[in-house]
């Protein structure tokens, strides 16, 4: 029977600045029950406070609620890991919450074949930002990828979108069903897990087109952009 | 509705022991610091100790450092503060508050008297 | 420790009254000072944290500022239910302190 092992701050996400959660991984318990807390203090502050939720981010966890969170300030913490033969203390954990923010996916990705009399027929989809996240007030820039691939193909292609909420993909395979889903990240921050798939049938008579991608730099109104096949690469990210 | 209500207090002799109780309901208890703060007759208010969420973080001031013990039981949404060695001077009225980290101590019960006397 | 000094112990004032309380601290406690109201034979009741922030359910006719080591409690216009002690807390270290207290009396 011995000490608990050192445990690790591993992660911390929140996902809007307002609340923030950070998780541990437990060292070796010594063979015996093992407790664990989490201490901070916020820079500049002399007096050290205790987690105030254990329970909503799951085991392991320190839930920050709204009145405890402040995106002006670097948080300093640090887990301690304490048994009947004696505890051991993670490495401290500097946290500024501007650049730990992990959004919770867009939302209502709708996707759409355009057949328009004059061009070629194009998948056109648009979303939605994640709710939590309010965009009025300047604090947030999201960014877009979207990814597609036919359902039994095993490659996804992505396209990055920009601050864009729709974008049109020009060259698809006809008669293919394709998933399509769609994620975001703020400018300093983490990309979101991708939104549940859609599906879209590509119809038959789909005009197929390998060497050029349509994408809309614009709202649908607005200027669109014909794109090479060498262009893109400049927009994917695997 | 937040509630705190302290119980315990009552006449004891000096080197005498007592234990207090503040039970706290309408909060999720174990989500706050809580303390004791006590108030001699007619005097100012003096903070006397601080527990953290989970017990990890205890404050006593230093007047009853040695003496004085807090703690807490989540499960039964309570705190406590046992008192040994008590002397003339601790005579007050006892009052849990509960600390808001991001703000003061923004709940407080009703009070506890406690007086040490022969 | 850090001593808590409030200005003045006592204050006579008339209803509508401009009624300011001041609290020194014996050093820097940057803005982590509270203002609680106590009436008699009731527990105190937070007014003001974080020096300046009111707390939810209290009239806007207290407000608290400074920093550092210089804090005020200002009533804009002193009502009947105003009547009562005030004190100020620092919650910047251990020992937490309070001031002596300010008792606010009818003229």
């Known amino acids: 029977q011995l000490p608990p092992g050192k445990p690790e701050i591993f992660k911390c996400r929140s996902p809007n600045k307002e609340t923030f959660t950070c998780w541990w991984r437990p060292g070796t318990d010594g063979g015996l029950p093992t407790n664990y807390s989490l201490t901070y203090h916020r820079e500049g502050e002399t007096l050290m406070h205790e987690c105030p939720d254990y329970i909503t981010g799951g085991p392991n966890s320190c839930h920050f609620g709204k009145q405890y969170t402040s995106m002006w300030r670097t948080y300093v913490m640090m887990v301690n890991a304490t048994n009947q033969m004696g505890s051991s203390f993670s490495d401290e954990l500097y946290v500024d919450v501007t650049y730990i923010v992990q959004p919770d996916p867009p939302l209502e990705l709708t996707v759409e074949v355009k057949q328009p009399e004059d061009r070629k027929p194009y998948l056109w989809m648009k979303w939605s930002p994640p709710t939590l996240i309010d965009l009025k007030t300047g604090w947030f820039t999201l960014l877009y990828e979207i990814r597609l691939k036919p359902e039994k193909a095993a490659e996804w292609e992505t396209h990055f979108a920009g601050q864009q909420t729709e974008f049109k993909i020009l060259s698809l395979h006809p008669g293919q069903k394709y998933l399509v889903q769609v994620r975001c990240k703020p400018d300093h921050g983490y990309w979101s897990a991708w939104s549940p798939a859609t599906f879209i049938q590509i119809p038959s008579d789909f005009i197929m087109n390998d060497e050029q991608k349509l994408i809309s730099e614009e709202d649908l109104g607005g200027e669109q952009k014909l794109i090479s096949e060498e262009d893109l690469h400049h927009h994917h990210h695997h | 509705e937040v509630q705190l209500v302290e119980s315990g207090g009552g006449l004891v002799k000096p080197g005498g022991s007592l234990r207090l109780s503040c039970a706290a309901s309408g909060i999720t208890f174990s989500s706050y610091s809580m303390n004791w703060v006590r108030q001699a007759p007619g005097k100012g208010l003096e903070w006397v100790s601080s527990i953290s969420t989970r017990s990890s973080l205890i404050h006593y001031a230093d007047s009853v450092k040695g003496r004085f013990t807090i703690s807490r039981d989540n499960a039964k949404n309570s705190l406590y503060l046992q008192m040994n060695s008590l002397r003339d001077e601790d005579t007050a009225v006892y009052y849990c508050?509960?600390?808001?980290?991001?703000?003061?101590?923004?709940?407080w019960g009703q009070g506890t008297l406690v007086i040490v006397s022969s | 420790d850090i001593q808590l000094t409030q200005s003045p112990s006592f204050l006579s004032a008339s209803v509508g009254d401009r009624v300011t309380i001041t609290c020194w601290a014996s050093?820097?406690?940057?803005?982590?000072l509270a203002w609680y109201q106590q009436k008699p034979g009731k527990a105190p009741k937070l007014l003001i944290y974080v020096a300046s922030t009111l707390q939810s359910g209290v009239p806007s006719r207290f407000s608290g500022s400074g920093s550092g080591t210089e804090f005020t409690l200002t009533i804009s216009s002193l009502q009947p239910e105003d009547f009562a002690t005030y004190f100020c807390q620092q919650l910047n270290s251990y020992p937490l302190t309070f001031g002596g207290g300010t008792k606010v009396e009818i003229k």
């Open positions: 050093q820097g406690i940057s803005s982590y």
């Open positions: 508050a509960r600390w808001d980290a991001a703000a003061a101590f923004d709940y």
